[in-house]
Interface confidence: medium
């Protein structure tokens, strides 16, 4: 490898640019050294002296090679619906992400500005699209032959059990009740639970309001921060 010995400051020739980790100082008209992450420019360079760098103070940071006069302030502490996934250090900002059971309704450059609880599909409705770190759950009415009897952000509609003799027919929110002793399951697809957004933290549950009557529609419910759609519980 070629020897790369620093010799800043220096004047760039026409047609050439300053090297990596150097910047062009308009006042000195020289290529000067940048400060490393975790530092800032305490004294700017001159024609005869290079940039003087100093460490960032507590609760401030610089993530990139820079020549800023002051380090950036770390973001405010994470709210109760968030977890701190990256601490504030001299080289990186604090990053807050949503707790399990919540999704990011308003993101920022890194992490999340506003978390919201994942929609819970009420009985008669199942999860059509699971929640992710950045999107809410989408619920759908259980199709004929399927049901969901839970208020959940993860349960999908399950097939009714097939009875030799039916005592009570199933509906969208209740399984069929058989009189025979050996009911059989239909072959409709079916894992019961869908995965939550990835997290290593403990589950944070919300109190669940009483479910209301399920409508007899069969469309996918809208996403978004509008008032709770039918088939889902309020936030």
């Amino acid at each position: 490898l070629p020897a790369q010995v620093a010799f800043t400051p220096y004047a760039p020739e026409p047609g050439s640019t300053c090297r990596l980790r150097e910047y062009y100082d308009q006042t000195a008209q020289m290529c000067c050294s940048k400060c490393s992450p975790g530092q800032h420019a305490k004294v700017f360079c001159t024609k005869t002296s290079d940039t003087v760098c100093d460490s960032c103070e507590d609760s401030t940071y610089t993530q990139l090679w820079n020549w800023v006069p002051e380090c950036l302030s770390c973001g405010s502490r994470c709210s109760s619906d968030q977890v701190e996934t990256q601490a504030c250090t001299r080289e990186q900002n604090r990053i807050c992400t949503c707790r399990p059971g919540w999704y990011c309704a308003l993101s920022k450059q890194e992490g999340c500005r506003l978390c919201a609880p994942l929609r819970k599909c009420r009985p008669g409705f199942g999860v059509a699209r699971p929640g992710t770190e950045t999107s809410d759950v989408v619920c759908k009415p259980c199709a004929p032959g399927t049901f969901s009897n839970t208020t959940s952000s993860t349960d999908i509609c399950r097939p009714h059990q097939i009875c030799n003799v039916v005592a009570i027919p199933g509906n969208a929110s209740m399984d069929a009740v058989c009189t025979s002793t050996s009911p059989t399951r239909s072959m409709a697809p079916g894992a019961v639970h869908l995965p939550q957004p990835v997290s290593t933290r403990s589950q944070h549950t919300q109190p669940t309001p009483e479910p209301s009557t399920a409508p007899s529609t069969s469309f996918l419910l809208p996403m978004g921060p509008s008032p709770p759609a039918e088939g889902s519980t309020g936030d």
Epitope: V5, Y10, E13, P14, G15
Partner: antibody
């Protein structure tokens, strides 16, 4: 690999004209400033002219100002030197060279083309 | 006369260390512009040896090193070898001339 190939040299009478070409390959031509350097027989190196990557900025040595014109065709990856009103003291091997993007210096050179100005 | 001043010749025995000086002025080295060094073997085009005072392009042996301080610069060659016999040129940008300038060249002879 980077290659620079000059052509267009030859014998010309004083007051005459000649156009040198330098075909470049093996690098992003538009990203580099280019230059012409000459060397009279048995003498040292003399910078002649330079041009920026886009072609907007040009530079000339006092000895050729007003007589020589540097240009480039980036679509053809070719550098040119139009030499008019040639004099006996312009006799030299003419090299085209690529200017280093960082710090400066001419990092690649062609093999040179001989221009002889004589009656 | 060249804007950058070099000795016309230097010599040394194989294995020895030699230095070639290059003296500039306030409008080139003194203005902060770097020094570049070229080696020209007989009958060939110049080759960049050192650029930006001290930087060796890949493929250049570490026997070659550059130095600059104020308005003067130097090229040092250690462990001199027969194949180092060549002409050596220093070069910089000159702000008063708005152009690039070369030293007159130094012929290195390996005894």
């Amino acid at each position: 690999q980077v290659q620079l190939l000059e052509s267009g040299g030859g014998l010309v009478q004083p007051g005459g004209s000649l156009r040198l070409s330098c075909a470049a390959s093996g690098f992003s031509f538009t990203s580099y400033a280019m230059t012409w350097v000459r060397q009279a027989p048995g003498k040292g190196l003399e910078w002649v002219s330079g041009i920026s990557g886009g072609g907007a900025a040009t530079f000339y040595a006092d000895s050729v100002k007003g007589r020589f014109t540097i240009s480039r065709d980036n679509s053809k990856n070719t550098l040119y030197l139009q030499m008019n009103s040639l004099r006996a003291e312009d006799t030299a091997v003419y090299y085209c060279a690529r200017q280093s993007q960082y710090v400066g210096g001419f990092d690649y050179w062609g093999q040179g083309t001989l221009v002889t100005v004589s009656s | 006369q060249s804007v950058l001043t070099q000795p016309p010749s230097v010599s040394g025995a194989p294995g020895q260390r030699v230095t070639i000086s290059c003296t500039g002025s306030s409008s080139n080295f003194g203005a902060g512009y770097g020094v570049h060094w070229y080696q020209q073997l007989p009958g060939t085009a110049p080759k960049l040896l050192i650029h930006g005072n001290t930087n060796r392009p890949s493929g250049v042996p570490d026997r070659f090193s550059g130095f600059k301080s104020g308005t003067s610069a130097s090229l040092a060659i250690t462990g001199l070898q027969a194949e180092d016999e060549a002409d050596y040129y220093c070069q910089s940008y000159d702000s008063s001339l708005s152009g690039w300038v070369f030293g007159g060249g130094t012929k290195l002879t390996v005894l």
